[in-house]
Interface confidence: low
């Protein structure tokens, strides 16, 4: 064999006896007829030698060390070569060592080409015998980062101040490349950063520096995990010890892109997070240890990356290709901010782009899936605009305000489905006709259904909320003067079962001047509660609303107001109420800003209640609540 090392290559080759074997016959290195058991070759030297036995690999090992000095001159960055070439070396178990020294302010990055590295613990060995031992430096102290095999997830290791990389190749291994390159980086301000890349499902076991011995005092080590968006990562601690801290606290911190509470801080004894979608970082922070009884901090943990379970494996098709002017947003329900870690909950488009919220628009067919441990953490909000621009075309036209079935089949609860109904100003008005008569939600008779319709003006300058209405009441239809939004809001998961009860038809009708008209057909045996729009804030200035209340021939209606006075104080104009019998046109007019509200009155025929507001002074608003109760007539008054 001949080994020639170029001058100033900073390479030293050492051939020495390996682990002693029980072989009876010894073996020697032979140079110029001299028999020796160790040979050192330095830069600029050329040595020819041989062995005294047929199988030197059973006796000797070879170490090739290259010192790279980044302190006094430029650093030779880039792909690291195996020098001398393995083809020129004797077939011994060989270890290539690269010792890089750099300033504390310089970061050094080892980049591993595929196959990436897999960390092994004490007592473990690599199946192919190829091992990578990596250590760093804190001042004069060497810190073992870890021992690694091939076929893993570790793609990069960043350190500063220096790095020692030892690549051990068994004598029979044909490898002739180092498999890594070195790059310079800015200071990382910590012991090291290990990047672990998952292409698909898999797991990685990783350890703190110096494991199973103690992690250096008051140091920081970070692992960066790159996880495809459609997969989920879970962290579990396999083994850890805590040292005795004098100052600070030993902890792990998670940094999750998109989280509002980064970093998420955990004690080592806490249950660690699972079900994380996408990339994340984990950092181990040591403390100032007690000088007398330091103890040791060490951590061995596993990251498991897998396809999400159950619901999350499914692909849902949301076909909005035949919809117009509609958007569907899936987003997190509002929750109280908590410092406690909550696993990510994501919705994915085409299983690739995952985010905490997603908006789908009409005109396309969308494929979505979920990355979420608990889909009740998400809800859906949908907006659809139905607009009429040409009153001649729209008049008398009807549209069904119905939640499309494919939206109901998504595994996420529908929160709001809002229809924005737009009409040409002063040309058309709207009428809402429910499939089932509606009840107005009041404190006295609250809705207890799984959903309600919230009806409000959709004119930006107008603050007018007509109320919340649910199925099972006496309101047969609601007419409104101009643009409104109707929002179907769900209150319970049982909405899925009750979805058949939803059904509201909107029709464009000739324009009328009142803000709203409620047609009420009370049922016998039940008290109908009705209240003016904008309850709690007061009917807007100069607004007029009416109730058309039907009374069957064999019944009498009792109209009751729940206050003695309206409480309104007018700044300008008058507030009044008209109660008019529809058959005789006889009417009573009450000045709401002056008069006492009428005592309970009985009506044998259908009648109108019309309330018109003045411009009230602030704080003295017009809010009225009244009820209608039917009872059988005892005497025929016709």
């Amino acid at each position: 064999f001949e080994i020639a090392l170029p001058r100033e290559s900073n390479i030293t080759v050492l051939i020495k006896l390996g682990t002693p074997t029980l072989l009876a016959k010894p073996c020697y290195i032979v140079i110029s007829k001299r028999h020796i058991t160790m040979l050192s070759i330095k830069s600029g030297e050329r040595i020819v030698f041989t062995f005294s036995c047929q199988s030197p690999e059973n006796h000797f090992v070879i170490e090739i060390q290259k010192n790279i000095d980044c302190m006094s001159g430029p650093c030779p960055f880039g792909e690291v070569q195996l020098q001398p070439s393995t083809s020129l070396l004797p077939t011994l178990n060989r270890t290539f060592i690269w010792d890089v020294k750099a300033h504390k302010s310089i970061g050094l990055e080892l980049q591993f080409s595929i196959p990436r590295l897999r960390q092994i613990g004490p007592g473990e060995s690599c199946p192919d015998g190829v091992t990578h031992s990596i250590s760093g430096r804190i001042d004069a102290t060497v810190v073992r980062i870890g021992t690694f095999c091939s076929n893993g997830t570790v793609s990069r290791i960043k350190m500063q101040e220096g790095v020692k990389m030892a690549l051990h190749l068994p004598w029979f291994h044909p490898r002739n490349v180092s498999g890594f390159s070195i790059a310079n980086r800015s200071s990382i301000k910590r012991l090291c950063i290990i990047e672990s890349v998952f292409e698909g499902e898999g797991s990685a076991t990783l350890m703190s520096a110096n494991y199973p011995e103690g992690f250096p005092e008051d140091e920081l080590m970070t692992w960066q995990f790159v996880v495809p968006a459609h997969l989920r990562a879970s962290v579990s601690f396999l083994n850890f010890n805590l040292s005795n801290c004098e100052r600070k606290e030993e902890r792990v911190e998670y940094y999750i892109p998109g989280s509002t509470t980064n970093p998420e801080v955990f004690k080592l004894e806490d249950k660690q997070p699972g079900n994380m979608a996408g990339n994340f970082n984990l950092s181990l922070q040591g403390c100032d240890q007690d000088a007398q009884s330091p103890g040791i901090l060490r951590l061995q943990f596993q990251v498991l990356v897998q396809h999400p379970q159950n619901e999350s494996n499914k692909i849902y098709v949301v076909d909005l290709s035949n919809e117009r002017a509609m958007s569907l947003t899936i987003e997190p329900r509002p929750v109280k901010q908590s410092r406690k870690f909550v696993p990510g909950c994501f919705v994915c488009l085409e299983s690739r782009t995952c985010s905490s919220n997603l908006t789908l628009t009409s005109g396309s067919k969308h494929k979505i899936s979920f990355l979420c441990d608990d889909l009740t953490r998400l809800w859906m909000n949908v907006e659809k605009t139905i607009s009429c621009t040409d009153h001649r075309y729209c008049q008398r036209k009807s549209y069904s305000l119905q939640v499309p079935s494919d939206i109901l089949h998504l595994p996420v609860e529908l929160h709001d489905f809002s229809w924005k109904l737009l009409v040409p100003k002063d040309r058309l008005s709207l009428v809402l006709v429910p499939a089932q008569k509606l009840q107005q939600h009041t404190h006295e008779k609250p809705c207890n259904t799984s959903f309600s319709y919230l009806v409000a003006s959709a004119i930006p300058s107008q603050d007018l909320y007509f109320g919340s209405f649910c199925p099972g009441g006496s309101i047969k239809q609601i007419q409104v003067k101009q643009n409104i939004s109707v929002t179907l809001r769900t209150f319970a998961p049982s909405f899925q079962q009750e979805a058949s009860r939803q059904g509201l038809t909107v029709s464009f009708i000739p324009y009328f001047k009142e803000e709203g008209v409620f047609t009420v057909t009370p049922d016998t045996k039940s008290k109908v509660y009705l209240r003016t729009p904008n309850w709690d804030r007061g009917l807007p200035s100069l607004t007029s609303v009416s109730w058309n209340i039907s009374v069957p021939r064999d019944q009498v209606a009792c109209l009751t107001f729940f206050k003695e006075r309206s409480g309104v104080v007018c700044q300008t104009g008058r507030a009044f109420m008209i109660i008019q019998e529809q058959r005789t046109r006889a009417e009573e007019i009450f000045s709401l800003d002056e008069d006492v509200l009428p005592k309970p009155s009985f009506h044998h025929h259908s009648f109108w209640v019309n309330i018109s507001n003045c411009s009230p002074t602030s704080g003295k608003q017009l809010d009225l609540l009244f009820s209608v109760t039917l009872t059988p007539r005892t005497v025929d008054l016709t």
Partner: antibody
């Protein structure tokens, strides 16, 4: 051109099972949903349900839950309808039809398979 | 579920006459209604989709109206090959349903 070709007529005894196949050609099976429709002799059409050809998830109309199973073999572009514990009232022509997911109009139909259940 | 009621059950016309077939839904189903023609011993054939949209290859004499809850299929001038049973179908919500059919027969 698009074709749905169904298996031939079947005569079965009550209590037996039958499996009707529907082979799709001229398009990619997984691009459209597959629906099953029943027509009893001299009667109208009854929608039985559908199978999502992308995920294999079936949806059954209430009257067809239990004894009816929709399945797929995408490798041979074929959808199947299996009926177990056959009854005389299952005697009908069964059609497969191609539809749009969640909003189906059935633009192509199989020729129908007559299943007769008689002792 | 949406119940579709077709009328009349039978319509007797001579070739060249105008046919008007009605389909009424138990509630408003917007334009989620399709029409099919079925001849004896044959599978149904799609005629009209989404209440009024025409289908490629279907003669122009077939037209539909909607949306809402009342739908009409019109054959402007009946040809001999049009005598068949016509079904409307709701695609509004599960379960998808068919009307009971209208038989168009030769007078």
């Amino acid at each position: 051109q698009v074709q749905l070709v169904q298996s031939g007529s079947e005569l079965k005894k009550p209590g037996a099972s039958v499996k009707v196949s529907c082979k799709a050609s001229g398009y990619t099976l997984t691009d459209f949903s597959m629906h099953w429709v029943r027509q009893a002799p001299g009667q109208g059409l009854e929608w039985m349900g559908w199978i999502n050809t992308e995920t294999g998830a079936p949806t059954y109309a209430d009257d067809f839950k239990g004894r009816f199973v929709f399945s797929l073999d995408t490798s041979v572009s074929t959808a199947y309808l299996q009926i177990s514990s056959l009854k005389a009232e299952d005697t009908a022509v069964y059609y497969c039809s191609r539809g749009r997911d969640y909003d189906p109009h059935f633009d192509y139909w199989g020729q129908g398979t007559l299943v007769t259940v008689s002792s | 579920e949406i119940v579709l009621t077709q009328s009349p059950a039978t319509l007797s016309l001579s070739p060249g006459e105008r046919a008007t077939l009605s389909c009424r839904a138990s509630q408003s189903i917007s334009d989620f209604l399709h029409w099919y023609q079925q001849k004896p011993g044959q599978a149904p054939r799609l005629l009209i989709k989404y209440a009024s949209q025409s289908i490629s290859g279907i003669p122009a004499r077939f037209s539909g109206s909607g949306p809402g809850s009342d739908f009409t299929l019109t054959i402007s001038s009946v040809e001999p090959e049009d005598f068949a049973v016509y079904y409307c179908q709701s695609a509004h919500s599960f379960p998808y349903t068919f009307g009971q059919g209208t038989k168009l027969e030769i007078k």
